[in-house]
Structure formats: structure tokens, C-alpha cells
């Protein structure tokens, strides 16, 4: 039975050209992390995989940066940015809990973060 | 872009043979590296692979014998008492290990292992 | 130890015709398949990765499908550059394996 749940930033927004931080958390659940992936609609961002560390796509290898912990830095956002990104954490023995986060960016004014909340 | 550095060539089974692929324009610091091999006229098969922490898998044919290392922006195979079998063309790629495929490959270089 | 099986070792088609290339797991792999293309004198290009997903600059004309243990790889419309020896390479497990690729299957385009 999965008991564990994902708390993630929520819903995010940044500015143009600046940076962001993705992160999730999982709590509630003894499961072993053993891989943890960010994605952005299909396509592969980055992983951290608890034997090999981390792997950073090639087509996103000069814009994101791994950490802090299991989280992710975006950097140089342009509006492109905006939408929906996914923390996908493979345990074992419970399997995959997938949080979402939702990044806006702006063309200017100053960057708000949204409030924290949980998906189970 | 992903280069094989070092050229093949022909080797003795008393030698010790060592691959160095090159990674340009960015550091392997984030990157999964494998090695692949091919005999003439057979398949593709997997040797190995480095995380970017250092921590490495091989094929269990070739663990004890071959050896993959890492600097920022290198990785080295090295293969101790290469036989005749060992002759293939050696590729380096990107990724590898639930990276979504391995991906741009290195362009290869043939080892041919005679005594 | 994970073991690739890919079917059949080489197939004949004619240009604009289809090809299905199969590659079976020996347990599940949760479809952590990808398919490279390879001519002679090259190294593999990508072509599908994550069992169905289409790598980048890669015609629409291949597509990938499956799951568990079962997956497969079609070429429809095919063209003469399609003619190339394509493998299927599992990414659900590295310890204990002999191989993650199949044993390939060569295209034919007549």
C-alpha cells in the first residue's frame, strides 16, 4: 500500500531571465527512493538515481542545474518556461509518486511564490 | 558533442589497452557515460557504465577486466590482457540507464587485438 | 538478469511498405525500451526512447509501442534510408546483465 505523499512549491512564478527552484518532497512512506525524475510534459529534464547521481538531459544541459538535494534549478527562463513540470520518484517497494509543479514566467514585475501544498 | 580521443589500433594481448572519450562543451559532472562494443559483423553489446558520482556497472562478462574511470570531461576504458575476442569498435555515449536511451554516441574506433 | 530478445534477425520490405521489428523482455521492464538505427561505418542514432517516444529530428514514419515485456518498433511508409540494422535496448536494470541490447535486426529495402 502507497501511504507516502508528495509536497511540492506549488504553483511558481518567475522572472525572464532569472532562475527558479523545483523541488518536491516525500514524506510518510519508509519506501526506498531509488530514482528521482524532473520532467516537463514528455520530455526528460534530469534525474537523480540513487546509485549513479545525477544526469542532466543533453538539450537542457547549459539551463538546469542539479540540487539543492533532489530539487532542480532552472536558469535563463524565458516564457518558453511556463507550464507544467513533474517530480516522478521511483521507490521501492511502493513504486511512483508524481508531484506537480506549475511555473509561470514573466516578462518583468517581481516573482511571487505560491503556496506549498500536497498531492497525494 | 562526444569524441573517441584516442586512436585503435593494433594490440598485443600482453598490452594494456586504454579508450579516452572526450566530452565537449559541457562537464560530465551531470552526465551518465557508457561504453559499447561491436565485433565485425555482430551486434551491439554493453560493456559499462560511470555515473557522475563516479559509481560504475559492467556487463558481468566484463567485470575484473575492463575498467571505467572519469575525470571533468573524459572517460577512460581500460581493458587488462585483451584477447582476440576483444576486437570490435569501442563507441562512448551519453547516458544510459534510465536517461531516456543513450544519446549522441562517439563515432568509434576499431581495437584489433593480435599476438 | 534481463534478457532482450529481438525478432526476426532480418526482414525484407519494399519501399512504401511497413516493418514491424518485436523485442521481448525476459520479465518486465516498464517500459524502459529505446531503438537505435544503425548504417554501416556509423555509430546507433536514437530514434525511440521510453518505449514510444520519438527522438528529436526523427521522422514521424517510425513509431514505438508495448509495455511490460513486450514492445515493438514499426516503420510505415518506409524509404530507401530506412534500410539500416535497428536495435532495441532495455534501461530498467543494469546489475546482473549480460546485455541491455537485442541482437539487432537488419532492415532490407528493395
Known amino acids: 500500500m502507497m501511504t507516502g505523499t508528495i509536497e511540492t512549491t506549488g504553483n511558481i512564478s518567475a522572472k525572464k531571465g532569472g532562475s527558479v527552484i523545483l523541488q518536491c518532497h516525500l514524506s510518510s512512506t519508509t519506501a526506498q527512493v531509488t530514482q528521482v525524475n524532473w520532467e516537463q510534459q514528455d520530455q526528460l529534464l534530469a534525474i537523480c538515481n540513487a546509485d549513479l547521481g545525477w544526469h542532466i538531459s543533453p538539450s537542457f544541459k547549459d539551463r538546469v542545474a542539479p540540487g539543492p538535494g533532489l530539487g532542480l534549478t532552472l536558469q535563463s527562463l524565458t516564457v518558453n518556461d511556463t507550464g507544467e513540470y513533474f517530480c516522478i520518484y521511483h521507490t521501492y517497494p511502493d513504486g511512483t509518486y508524481t508531484g506537480r509543479i506549475f511555473l509561470e514566467v514573466l516578462e518583468s514585475s517581481v516573482a511571487e511564490h505560491g503556496a506549498r501544498f500536497q498531492i497525494p | 558533442q562526444v569524441q573517441l580521443e584516442s586512436e585503435g589500433g593494433l594490440f598485443k594481448p600482453t598490452d594494456t589497452l586504454t579508450l579516452t572519450c572526450t566530452v565537449s562543451?559541457?562537464?560530465?559532472?551531470?552526465?551518465?557515460m557508457s561504453w559499447v562494443r561491436q565485433a565485425p559483423g555482430k551486434g551491439l553489446e554493453w560493456i559499462g557504465i560511470?555515473?557522475?558520482?563516479?559509481n560504475t556497472y559492467y556487463a558481468n562478462w566484463a567485470k575484473g577486466r575492463f575498467t571505467i574511470s572519469k575525470t571533468s570531461t573524459t572517460v577512460e576504458l581500460k581493458i587488462t590482457s585483451p584477447t582476440t575476442e576483444d576486437t570490435a569498435t569501442y563507441f562512448c555515449?551519453?547516458?544510459?540507464?534510465?536517461?531516456?536511451?543513450?544519446?549522441?554516441w562517439g563515432p568509434g574506433t576499431l581495437v584489433t587485438v593480435s599476438s | 538478469d534481463i534478457v532482450m530478445t529481438q525478432t526476426p534477425a532480418s526482414v525484407e520490405v519494399a519501399v512504401g511498405g511497413t516493418v514491424t521489428i518485436k523485442c521481448q523482455a525476459s520479465?518486465?521492464?516498464?517500459?524502459?525500451l529505446n531503438w537505435y538505427q544503425q548504417k554501416p561505418g556509423q555509430p546507433p542514432k536514437l530514434l525511440i526512447y521510453?518505449?514510444?517516444k520519438l527522438a528529436s529530428g526523427v521522422p514521424s514514419r517510425f513509431s514505438g509501442s508495448g509495455s511490460g515485456t513486450e514492445y515493438t518498433l514499426t516503420i510505415s511508409g518506409v524509404e530507401s534510408a530506412d534500410a539500416a540494422t535497428y536495435y532495441c535496448?532495455?534501461?530498467?536494470?543494469?546489475?546482473?546483465?549480460?546485455?541491455?541490447f537485442g541482437g539487432g535486426t537488419e532492415v532490407v529495402v528493395k
Open positions: 560511470i555515473g557522475s558520482n563516479g
Open positions: 535496448q532495455q534501461e530498467h536494470s543494469v546489475g546482473n546483465v549480460d546485455n541491455v
Open positions: 562543451g559541457s562537464s560530465l559532472s551531470s552526465s551518465y
Open positions: 520479465q518486465s521492464i516498464s517500459s524502459y
Open positions: 555515449a551519453r547516458g544510459g540507464y534510465r536517461t531516456s536511451g543513450m544519446d549522441p
Open positions: 521510453d518505449a514510444l
